[in-house]
């Protein structure tokens, strides 16, 4: 499975979109986890709503938010107020019982803010809606460590 590299600015939001086959993953919850080491376990950060029909609702754990458009086959994860400690390898997962299928591997890189926090007090952040459909678009730079994006499953 290819690894997608996403770069975000410290203090900003980084949005990750993982696409999947909506029919194949019908009825399955999704999760975002952080890989502990190259071969280590993937530690759950946040997962979608426990009721699959409500997966479009945003679920939050700390500064990480997840929402799933189950009909379109896109799960969106937003890392808010990105910090240097957020850098690392993550996975989008599709959950089936106790098993987790990796949808996408994502390497998050955090870039230092060139403004160095100047004028940070003047930044305006629009109020967000509760559901996926109203999610604001976050900006990020991405590249792929291997070939195509999104990776084929």
């Amino acid at each position: 499975l290819n690894t997608t590299v996403l770069q975000g600015m410290a203090g900003q939001s980084l949005r990750v979109s993982c696409t999947y086959d909506a029919l194949k993953h019908w009825g399955r919850r999704k999760a975002w986890c952080r890989q502990l080491g190259e071969e280590g376990p993937c530690q759950r950060v946040v997962s979608t709503h426990g009721v699959w029909l409500l997966a479009f609702l945003k679920k939050r754990n700390g500064s990480t938010v997840i929402a799933d458009d189950t009909l379109a086959g896109t799960v969106t994860i937003t890392l808010k107020n990105l910090q240097a400690g957020d850098a690392g390898l993550y996975q989008c997962q599709s959950l089936r019982g106790r098993e987790a299928e990796v949808l996408q591997k994502v390497l998050v890189e955090v870039l230092e803010d060139p403004l160095d926090d100047q004028d940070a007090g003047d930044l305006w952040v629009p109020e967000e809606s509760s559901s996926f459909e109203g999610a604001q678009v976050e900006h990020s730079t991405s590249r792929n460590q291997e070939t195509s994006f999104p990776p084929t499953s």
Epitope: W26, G27, H49, V51, L53, L54, S130, S131, E133
Partner: antibody
Amino acid sequence: EVQLVESGGGLVQPGRSLRLSCTASGFTFGEYTMSWFRQAPGKGLEWVGFIGSKAYAGTTEYTASVKGRFTISRDGSKSIAYLQMNSLKTEDTAVYYCARGKRYSYGGWVPAFDVWGQGTMVTVSS
Amino acid sequence: DIQMTQSPSSLSASVGDRVTITCQASQDITNYLNWYQQKPGKAPKLLIYDASNLETGVPSRFSGSGSGTDFTFTISSLQPEDIATYYCQEYDSYLAFGGGTKVEIK
């Protein structure tokens, strides 16, 4: 007029089955999630389960206490939602309501229920 | 599972009074909360959705606020037709209802 009408309630012995119907009119039935709730005599409201709209291919979700015993289904051609109740227990005695999930203007839905039926009484007793 | 604690369980107020009902969730539920009115022998009626949005056709004297764990439902000026039981309902987990608040006229 947007309307939901439940039917099929009555007295049933423990362990037996009963099927409730919820007939919809005045709206495009297939576009909405339909839910069942219940209210035991003198008690509060309890969510039983719901069934997704046509887009969700009738996917169902249930509260833990009825999972494996109750089944929700829908017939789009007749605009009817059903609640099949098997292995009934005395604690299932309640007024059962069907309700429609609210749709946002942009097409998404919210689990707030904006149209309700009048309710049908189910009594489980020997 | 999330527990919804509604208070008070009952209250008595005069016509024209401001009435406030609170609903507390056992954990953060964002703004995933609705409020319903149920009159004796009748089905519930949706008043407020997403914690603060007034349902179409509902009088503006009804309002809702709050986020996280603490939510408030307010009737700005109580009317005789507002005699009912009011319920909050969360949808952050499995659509749990509060125990209800019975509102009566003094």
